[in-house]
């Protein structure tokens, strides 16, 4: 880092490697819930039309995919990997793809994803063996 | 030698604009994705717009989405911040930087080079 730029006081929100750069945050879908026609699909696409930048330089690109009776909806956000996300640990945060899982929600059906490369969560995969295929 | 000077900043009233201008020089303009980054007094760092090189894709942070427009002229190598609707916690210094050529990975994203920065207060 410069001399000329300050030192954060806040060392979550500065990051930096051995280099002295300043570590960039991620560059995610955030378009927090939206209803979405993604049914029975092995993959599908957010049809979210934000890119946020992330708060912080360590969050991650997340997806929750859910359905109940009365609608099926894509929730797109950023969130820091060391912390729980509608209550689940986010696996695979250092993926590069978006690999849902389905999680135990009582009167849902409910899958979540988290990756870590730009957009990432603009791209959302529900069968594993499908990942090899999938567009970078 | 690589520069990035930011000018553009001062005292303005809540509601009012300003635009900010980074003059960049010392490498090529049109390779590089820019970024405009804010610091508070006594806070962090702030990722506030990104820019792509070529096609003038766009980023904001949700704190400015809607009240902010990053730009830049490729022709005359400058980037630029039109900010509006300013509010008190838009206080800071505002620097803009360059980011590594690199891989899409947040782990090797990275700045390394910086302007000196432009001081905006918004204050009544």
């Known amino acids: 880092i410069p001399p000329h730029v300050p030192k954060s006081v806040n060392s979550d929100v500065m990051a930096s490697d051995n280099g002295g750069a300043v570590k960039l945050p991620q560059l995610c879908k955030f378009c927090d819930v939206r209803l979405s026609t993604c049914d029975n699909q092995k993959s599908c696409m957010s049809n979210c039309s934000i890119t946020a930048i992330c708060e912080k330089p360590h969050e991650v690109c997340v997806a929750v995919w859910r359905k109940n009776d009365k609608n099926i909806t894509l929730e797109t956000v950023c969130h820091d990997p060391k912390l729980t996300y509608h209550g689940f640990t986010l696996e695979d945060a250092a993926s590069p793809k978006c690999v849902m899982k389905e999680k135990k929600r009582a009167g849902e059906t409910f899958f979540m994803c988290a990756c870590n490369m730009e957009e990432c969560n603009d791209y959302i995969i529900f069968s594993e063996e499908y990942t090899t295929s999938s567009p970078d | 030698e690589v520069q990035l000077l930011e000018s553009g900043g001062g005292l303005v009233q809540p509601g009012g604009s300003l635009r900010l201008s980074c003059a960049a020089s010392?490498?090529?303009?049109?390779?590089?994705r820019m970024w405009w980054v804010r610091q508070a007094p006594g806070k962090g760092l702030e990722w506030v717009s990104?820019?792509?090189?070529?096609?003038?894709?766009?980023y904001y942070a949700r704190s400015v989405d809607g009240r902010f427009t990053i730009s830049r002229d490729n022709s005359k190598n400058t980037l630029y911040l039109q900010m509006n609707s300013l509010r008190a916690e838009d206080t800071a210094v505002y620097y803009c930087?360059?980011?590594?050529?690199?891989?899409?990975?947040?782990?090797?994203?990275?700045?390394?080079?910086w302007g000196q920065g432009t001081l905006v207060t918004v204050s009544s």
């Open positions: 010392g490498f090529t303009f049109t390779e590089y």
């Open positions: 990104a820019i792509e090189p070529i096609g003038n894709r766009t």
């Open positions: 930087a360059k980011q590594m050529p690199g891989q899409k990975w947040m782990a090797k994203s990275r700045f390394d080079y």
